[in-house]
């Protein structure tokens, strides 16, 4: 059907309580665009009856609540004057209670669901609330360890809980539950965020230091094979993740079909007061798409890019 | 809607004196820290001081400690900054600024000039 | 004292142009790094906080990376209110520093 296929992360979501994703993919969608939703290669598109537990609105699909049985593949099909792209996002429904246990055996949860407190600075939390402008959010109420957050040094800001003075106490498991009202009908969001603490930054802390790259462009020839080290320095102790993405996604999970691009095995050297991480990405083949998109190093809350460019014509072989 | 409105400012000899004042309305005040930042005539921003949101913690640059106090007034919604022993380097436009976590400036008044000159 | 040194200067740019602008701290200051706008005659204006935050009602095509010593600021796709000055601050340790500004020309 002429439709390039691109793959997006999974999505891991709580069941029982609203979802949404909008299918977004710049520059693609800054455009004159249709999109049209399916779920797992159907040939009917997702209903846009607003009725409907699950339908587009606009350029989202929007689950209301979410079931379990709603786990699978969905496809937005983008199309432009002369492009069409389609848009795999898998999502990935669990049954979870967030006072029954920790959300830390979940697999590959989000950065959203894990963030990070500085020890003694005032900083804050964020309630992830991604819904299209027909769902009305009402006030957000934070909750730690299943209690209720109340206290001098903690103020609810918007869709932030800010936290002063920050101690090796805020610690721990956190929600956020805020009332979303849809169609005169009201539901209940709540979002589990497993809180850590780092110190300061060097390698007392477990901020991660890019070495290379420095956010920079690199000259190379189309078709040609093409090997970039990210090179991190960590703390002996860290459990900072150090992975490429591109558009926000694993590049092993958005070079799924052609593994044109992929990700090298990670290796580090040992240092007596942190360690060097390397992890590589490899172009088996470098292609007139992959220039100007920014490929992203990330180490935790670092990140550095590289830009792929065609190198500039040589007119002295003319 | 968040309104911070400075005043106090004005032309001063060097070696003078002036207490610039802040009044914030639409936010809880007490909750949160403030700060006065400059800016000189060469456009340069500068850092001048924070006050923590219960009183208790005040920091400056080594530029203006022992000149300047910071303090704020809960009750009354109000912010100062008293400047005293001013010299030329202290020309600048001062803002005062909501600060939401560390060096989180999200909103600021629309500032008010000192001038210091003989 | 933390000196932050911002690049370039000034940089001219066409409408839609993808911009980047630099601070680099003389010493590692974590994440803690704000960027500003101010256009001329205006207040500094909030952009990003905490090295890659967006505040509240920024347009997305504004973004912030690095931590550390190293810190990015891009604009993708120019628009022509963004024609103005940048600022970024750290906040890591006292006295807080900014950096001397980035000021954008249309080419």
């Known amino acids: 059907d002429g439709c390039k296929d691109i793959f997006m992360k999974n999505e891991i979501l709580s069941a029982s309580q609203p979802f949404a994703f909008n299918c977004t993919f710049p520059p693609i969608t800054s455009g004159e665009v249709s999109v049209t939703w399916y779920k797992n290669s159907s040939k009917i598109p997702v209903s846009k009856i607003i009725q409907s537990r699950i339908h587009q609105d606009e350029t989202w699909i929007l689950f209301l609540p979410m079931e379990w049985g709603d786990s699978g593949v969905y496809q937005c099909v983008i199309k432009g004057r002369d492009s069409c792209h389609r848009i795999h996002v898998n999502l990935t429904v669990f049954e979870k209670h967030w006072c029954d246990t920790s959300i830390g055996g979940l697999p590959n949860l989000s950065d959203e669901y894990k963030q990070i407190l500085h020890l003694g600075k005032d900083d804050s939390l964020t309630c992830h609330l991604h819904f299209p402008k027909s769902c009305v959010l009402g006030p957000i109420k934070w909750y730690k360890d299943c209690n209720e957050i109340k206290g001098e040094r903690f103020t609810v800001l918007e869709t932030r809980l800010l936290v002063s003075n920050v101690s090796a106490e805020d610690r721990g498991n956190y929600a956020c539950q805020a009332i979303l009202t849809h169609s005169g009908k009201q539901y209940e969001v709540l979002n589990g965020i497993t809180v850590s603490i780092t110190e300061r930054a060097g390698y007392g802390g477990s901020v991660p230091k890019i070495i290379y790259p420095k956010n920079h462009s690199i000259e190379v020839q189309l078709g040609t094979t093409l090997i970039v080290d990210c090179n991190v320095t960590d703390t002996k102790d860290n459990t900072n993740l150090r992975c490429w993405r591109v558009n926000n996604t694993l590049v092993d999970d958005y070079y799924d079909e052609s593994k044109r691009i992929r990700e090298g095995v990670e290796t580090h050297v040992s240092f007596r007061e942190h360690n060097l991480y390397t992890v590589n990405i490899t172009f088996l083949e470098v292609k007139m798409e992959d220039y100007g998109l920014p490929f992203m190093c990330h180490a935790g809350v670092s990140t550095a890019y590289i830009i792929l460019q065609l190198p500039a014509p040589d007119f002295r072989a003319y | 809607e968040v309104m911070l409105v400075e005043s106090g400012g004005g032309l001063v000899k060097p070696g003078g004196s002036l207490k610039l004042s802040c009044a914030a309305s639409g936010i809880t005040f007490s909750r949160f820290a403030m700060s006065w930042i400059r800016q000189t005539p060469e456009k340069r921003l500068e850092w001048v001081a924070t006050i923590s949101s219960g009183d208790m913690y005040t920091y400056y640059p080594d530029s203006v400690k022992g000149r300047f106090t910071i303090s704020r007034d809960n009750a009354n919604n109000t912010l100062y900054l008293q400047m005293r022993s001013l010299r030329s380097e202290d020309t600048a436009m001062y803002y005062c600024?909501?600060?939401?976590?560390?060096?989180?400036?999200?909103?600021w008044g629309q500032g008010t000039l000192v001038t210091v000159s003989a | 004292e933390i000196k932050m040194t911002q690049s370039p200067s000034s940089l001219s740019a066409s409408l839609g142009d993808t911009i980047t602008i630099t601070c680099r701290a003389s010493q590692d200051i974590s994440v803690w790094l704000t960027w500003y706008q101010q256009k001329p005659g205006n207040i500094p204006k909030l952009l990003i906080y905490k090295a890659s935050n967006l505040h509240t009602g920024v347009p997305p095509r504004f973004s912030g990376s690095g931590s550390g010593t190293d810190f990015t600021f891009t604009i993708s796709s120019l628009q022509p209110e963004d024609i103005t000055t940048y600022y970024c601050l750290q906040s890591q340790s006292y006295p807080w520093t900014f950096g001397g500004g980035t000021k954008l020309e249309i080419k």
């Open positions: 600024a909501i600060m939401i976590t560390t060096g989180e400036h999200a909103y």
